[in-house]
Interface confidence: low
């Protein structure tokens, strides 16, 4: 007859390993006992169980409460058993030693493989802001055994960097995700993906990224000059930008105090009915925690009676 | 006004897919997000999965198999496919926008789909 | 999926009175907390975001608190218009919802 095993029974940690051993023999042989113990190379053999025929299973002390035979119905030539909640101190050779009558005693020698699935982290990088050169996004660290895979998953342009730490029954994997930020990656996702022998799909976690910046700032309403003329109802100038965090707006006049009546509504200046103390210099101020941007536009109110006798003037010259 | 509206048949037959419509007016989806969450009756919120401005897609885990977000940018619309529907699936459907991260600050009024043949 | 744990699920309170609603983590999730507030019928409307800030049109009565793993809605004198249901939600990779929290009139 002979023995069935595997080389290698791989378990994820705290699963239940089945230690498979099996007496294929010949008609009328019998099995007494399999004796189960642990042989790592360099140290001596420590017995887990014995399972006698007759007298049942025995387990020894080390393993109490952690070995037992798979549930029935039960061949008797089967001497597997089974490895409670497999730990990564379990890891190693394991050899089971089959008496048989007649035939005599076979041995077989097994690798349990318990894979710690990894518990992945993302740590985002320092604040991003428009105008820095290349700068950490996030950082992504996995441990597991045996090391586990990180890589990123994003449109985002960007260059990864990947290193590795072995421990004694485990490795750690850091990748870093470096960009230069810039406005259009406003919202888009940095997801980072983890593989493992010992996890059923791959763990992502996503960091959504956050850039810093403030757009150029400008003035619209003065396209049309003639329409700023004494008396117009409804004028107004509006403050052109763009910011993350969003911006907030404030005017002022570069010439004096703003007049009397111009309402000040976050970035719209409005005016009420024209004259010629609304003519001056006023400024847009936009800020936000990042930066600050200002623009300015000269307003010129015309007068139509003015213009008109310029006008005339022109007209009895020629 | 940022307004988000969901459509699309109330009434699913268990195993076929199914497959709602969020129109997006009154703003620029760029640097946004549209998002769906589902709801069952008397039951808590479920995110389902996202759509950026740039086109790439984000799925909940749990559902990633049968789910499919898309666009039409020219319409300003999104859609969902969700495949092989059954009972469980019976729920109000939101669509919702997110800014930079996964929380939403519009969404549409819902609309329930429920499975059953 | 990092689990959202709200507590209670449910409470009576008068108009005036404080209410709090915790939120726990089952991992850290730093500040990516966000809070909605729920009317039978409706789509939820966002309350808090990145744990303590209030979003647009927020009445000040209401705040968020914590970092990490617990979290807290406090909602001040409370008001006819508060009785709703309250959600927690992380936005640390995929995103989950609490249970919610139901505030019935006492």
């Known amino acids: 007859g002979e023995l069935e095993t595997s080389d290698v029974v791989t378990v994820v940690l705290g699963q239940d390993a089945k230690l498979p051993c099996f007496y294929r023999g010949d008609s009328g042989e019998q099995v007494g006992q399999v004796a189960w113990a642990r042989v790592d190379a360099g140290e001596g053999a420590q017995e887990l169980a014995l399972l006698h025929s007759k007298y049942g299973l025995h387990v020894s002390p080390a393993y109490e409460g952690r070995v037992e035979q798979p549930p029935p119905p039960r061949n008797p030539l089967d001497g597997s058993v089974l490895l409670r909640n497999a730990v990564q101190a379990d890891e190693g050779e394991y050899e089971c030693r089959v008496s048989t009558f007649p035939a005599g005693s076979f041995q077989a020698r097994l690798r349990l493989r318990v894979l710690v699935p990894p518990l992945p982290s993302l740590n985002p990088g320092p604040a991003l802001e428009e105008g820095q050169g290349l700068t950490l996004a996030a950082s992504c660290t996995a441990e597991g055994s045996p090391a586990p895979s990180v890589t990123w998953d994003t449109e985002v342009k960007g260059t990864t960097s990947s290193r590795s730490f072995k421990h004694s029954r485990s490795a750690a994997v850091t990748s870093e995700f470096h960009l230069v930020p810039s406005r259009s990656m406003n919202g888009q996702p940095l997801t980072c993906v983890v593989s493992h022998p010992g996890l059923l799909q791959d763990q992502r976690i996503t960091h959504i990224l956050h850039v810093s910046f403030l757009a150029e700032a400008s003035v619209r309403g003065l396209e049309d000059q003639n329409l700023w003329h004494i008396g117009r109802e409804g004028a107004m100038l509006k403050c052109l930008s763009e910011g993350q965090p969003p911006p907030s707006y404030n005017w002022t006049r570069l010439d004096g105090p703003l007049p009397s009546g111009v309402r000040v509504d976050g970035d719209t200046l409005g005016f009420p009915p024209l004259t010629t103390e609304h003519s001056g210099i006023y400024v847009c101020h936009v800020s936000n925690e990042f930066s600050s941007r200002d623009s300015q536009v000269t307003v010129d109110v015309l007068d139509p009676q003015e213009d008109s006798g310029k006008q005339v003037d022109l007209v009895s010259a020629s | 006004q940022v307004q988000l509206q969901e459509s699309g048949p109330g009434l699913v037959k268990p195993s076929e897919t199914l497959s709602l419509t969020c129109t997006v007016s009154g703003g620029s989806l760029t640097n946004y997000g549209v998002h769906w969450v589902r709801q069952p009756p008397g039951k808590g919120l479920e995110w389902i999965g996202v759509?950026?401005?740039?086109?790439?897609?984000n799925y909940n885990p749990s559902l990633k198999s049968r789910v499919t977000i898309s666009r039409d940018t020219s319409k300003n619309q999104v859609s969902l496919k969700l495949s092989s529907v059954t009972a469980a699936d019976t729920a109000v459907y939101y669509c919702?926008?997110?800014?930079?991260?996964?929380?939403?600050?519009?969404w549409g009024q819902g609309t329930l789909v429920t499975v059953s043949s | 999926d990092i689990q959202m744990t709200q507590s209670p699920s449910s409470l009576s309170a008068s108009v005036g009175d404080t209410v709090t609603i915790t939120c726990r983590a089952s991992?850290?999730?730093?500040?990516?907390l966000a809070w909605y507030q729920q009317k039978q019928g409706k789509a939820p409307k966002l309350l808090v975001y990145?744990?303590?800030n209030l979003a647009d049109g927020v009445p000040s009565r209401f705040s968020g608190s914590g970092s990490g793993t617990d979290f807290t809605l406090k909602i001040n004198s409370l008001q006819p218009e508060d009785f709703a249901t309250y959600y927690c939600q992380h936005f640390w990779g995929t995103p989950t919802f609490g249970g919610g929290t139901k505030v019935e009139i006492k």
């Open positions: 990145a744990a303590t």
């Open positions: 919702a926008r997110s800014g930079k991260w996964y929380y939403f600050d519009y």
């Open positions: 991992q850290n999730i730093y500040s990516n």
């Open positions: 759509i950026w401005s740039g086109g790439s897609t």
